[in-house]
């Protein structure tokens, strides 16, 4: 019997210092570029080698960025989100949602990490 895939969602505040080449990551998403169905949120699509984000080590590809320096990223056009990061200053605070895939046991069995029950 196949196991069920669940997701463990956690949030984290990540403080980055802009490096010589910037923050060092790429994003997808926005109201005009939905990366995830029915979700116009902003997601990390690439971490640049040796960039500020890579050297910090906490930001991961696939993370959803909820806010930048306290400013919500909901309902933004893609380019507006890009510009927000570019104009965020030297010290940048990111509120991030990590989504960790958890493989549970067979259906009908409450596997480890199953929040139900």
């Amino acid at each position: 019997m196949n196991g069920r895939v669940d997701y463990l969602v956690t949030e984290e505040e990540i403080n980055l210092t802009r490096g010589p080449s910037g923050l060092g990551f790429n994003i997808v998403g926005g109201t005009d570029q939905q990366y995830v169905s029915n979700d116009s949120g902003i997601y990390v699509s690439r971490i640049k080698e040796n960039g500020a984000a890579a050297l910090d080590g906490r930001l991961q590809e696939g993370d959803k960025i909820l806010s930048v320096n306290g400013q919500d990223l909901k309902n933004l056009l893609h380019q507006d989100a890009v510009d927000l990061f570019r104009n965020a200053g030297y010290a940048v605070s990111l509120r991030v949602q990590h989504r960790l895939q958890v493989q549970n046991g067979p259906i009908g069995h409450r596997g480890e990490g199953d929040p139900s029950g």
Epitope: L23, I27, V28, Q33, Y35, S45, R46, V82
Partner: nanobody
Framework: EVQLVESGGGLVQAGGSLRLSCAAS????????MAWFRQAPGKEREFVAA????????YYADSVKGRFTISRDNAKNTVYLQMNSPKPEDTAVYVC?????????????????????WGQGTQVTVS
């Protein structure tokens, strides 16, 4: 994994025209930033043109500005390079490059390090 396949190369006369295509795999093609580079024998890889995810912004090397046009069709997962009035010095292998998403830093379209995925290339010879 993104795969890029170029086509449309061949022999063209100087002053003629040629259209190169680059077909990309992946359901999120509309988030890719795309570019064309070229490499002539014994020379460094050279930036030709780039286009953003929506097609609203394009960038060109000075050597091709006004002659070449980059465009994309997100419904077909394809980016194009229209080569008008090619010159013998445009002879090279033309390679397509892609990256998923937009950099939050200063965009340097001519920098190969901006891109993660590369095609095998298509030969263009201008006689």
């Amino acid at each position: 994994e993104v795969q890029l396949v170029e086509s449309g190369g061949g022999l063209v006369q100087a002053g003629g025209s040629l259209r190169l295509s680059c077909a990309a795999s992946g359901r999120t093609f509309s988030t890719y930033e795309m570019a064309w580079f070229r490499q002539a024998p014994g020379k460094e890889r050279e930036f030709v043109a780039a286009i953003n995810w929506s097609g609203s912004s394009t960038y060109y090397a000075d050597s091709v500005k006004g002659r070449f046009t980059i465009s994309r069709d997100n419904a077909k997962n394809t980016v194009y390079l229209q080569m008008n009035s090619p010159k013998p010095e445009d002879t090279a292998v033309y390679v397509c490059a892609a990256v998923i998403g937009s950099t939050v830093d200063e965009y340097r379209p001519s920098d190969p390090l901006e891109y993660d995925y590369w095609g095998q290339g298509t030969q263009v010879t201008v006689s």
